[in-house]
């Protein structure tokens, strides 16, 4: 069974998938469509790297642009370095500026909804 066939079988169960499952899926050439990606739990999407999301979505990655202001895409973008987002060539904006340090202060983030940044 190839990645696409596997994805079709598990698609309806993905809404509650944890980050670990999404990371594993990204290695299986599933080419997740954006409609499915938008239904994923925000907390499961946030830890994914740009490379992992690119692999997870495959050719559908260009669809991130159209949804960049909708959750979970919006919140995921806020967590990525702008340099990394730029590698996608989609014109995604809102990433962490170059030279900034991300502090993983869970309390700060829980209160503000965004990561704590220290300037250069």
């Amino acid at each position: 069974m190839n990645g696409s066939e596997y994805f079709v079988k598990i698609q309806s169960f993905l809404g509650g998938a944890p980050t670990e499952d999404l990371k594993a899926l990204s290695q299986q050439n599933v080419s997740m469509d954006l409609a499915t990606f938008m239904k994923l739990r925000t907390d499961a999407v946030l830890p994914l790297t740009v490379a992992e999301v690119q692999k997870l979505l495959g050719p559908h990655v260009e669809g991130l642009k159209a949804e960049e202001r909708h959750r979970p895409v919006r919140d995921w973008i806020l967590r990525q370095r702008q340099d990394d987002l730029d590698t996608l060539g989609l014109g995604l904006q809102g990433g962490i500026p170059n030279g900034y340090l991300v502090l993983d202060l869970s309390m700060q983030e829980a209160l503000s909804g965004t990561p704590c940044l220290l300037g250069p």
Epitope: K65, A66, H70, R71
Partner: antibody, heavy 119, light 108 residues
Framework: EVQLVQSGAEVKKPGASVKVSCKAS????????MDWVRQAPGQGLEWMGD????????IYNQKFNGRVTMTEDKSASTVYMELSSLRSEDTAVYYC????????????WGQGTTVTVSS | EIVLTQSPATLSLSPGERATLSCSAS???????LSWYQQKPGQSPRLLIY???NLASGIPARFSGSGSGTDYTLTISSLEPEDFAVYYC?????????FGGGTKVEIK
């Protein structure tokens, strides 16, 4: 057949609100966002915002400054656009238009709803 | 916001002639994020072209699109009577999404 059927024409007084509906049929409702675009008499097209029917997430054009609200009823495959604090310049035809999630173009449009704001 | 300026505002041509419509953006638009719509009087807009040059379903091959950066073009190779309408370009490269002011193609 894919269809978007909108509610009928409305006449409203300045300061009132209007709620326009758009009923979708012939496709998987949650695979497409629904956008709203308006057109004042003799004018061009203006994008108002969109809603993701699957999550209820919305994005609005800042021009409407909190006056627009978009909602959905998945069980009825219907989206709604409410515009409040109406003024004469809100007189326009309001269109719903579907947009496949992950794309930015509108491949099917409703027939339009004429909203007239007049004292 | 990105302002899309369409020119000319009105194009007077005869059936069989070639129509060239221009859409100029106030700042660069990624070509994948530009589309064209046709609107006839009393009707809803209809998608013609997406991603600058891809024909929408059911659109005849006499329509074509091209361009990049700030300059985009819609071409109708040989006008048919049903092509006389208003044409709008639309960008979703930058928020808020915007439309051009339209070009009316009328019968000469």
């Amino acid at each position: 057949e894919v269809q978007l059927v909108q509610s009928g024409a409305e006449v409203k007084k300045p300061g009132a609100s209007v709620k326009v509906s758009c009923k979708a049929s012939g496709y998987t409702f949650t695979d497409y966002n629904m956008d709203w675009v308006r057109q004042a008499p003799g004018q061009g097209l203006e994008w108002m915002g969109d809603i993701n029917p699957s999550t209820g997430g919305t994005i609005y054009n800042q021009k409407f400054n909190g006056r627009v609200t978009m909602t959905e009823d998945k069980s009825a495959s219907t989206v709604y656009m409410e515009l409040s604090s109406l003024r004469s310049e809100d007189t326009a035809v309001y269109y719903c238009a579907r947009r496949r999630i992950g794309t930015g173009y509108f491949d099917v449009w409703g027939q339009g709803t004429t909203v007239t704001v007049s004292s | 916001e990105i302002v899309l300026t369409q020119s000319p505002a009105t194009l007077s041509l005869s059936p069989g002639e070639r129509a060239t419509l221009s859409c100029s953006a106030s700042s660069s638009v990624i070509s994948s994020y530009l589309s064209w719509y046709q609107q006839k009087p009393g009707q809803s807009p209809r998608l013609l072209i997406y991603r600058t040059s891809n024909l929408a379903s059911g659109i005849p091959a006499r329509f074509s699109g091209s361009g990049s950066g700030t300059d985009y073009t819609l071409t109708i190779s040989s006008l048919e009577p049903e092509d006389f309408a208003v044409y709008y370009c639309h960008q979703w490269s930058s928020f808020p999404y915007t439309f051009g002011g339209g070009t009316k193609v009328e019968i000469k």
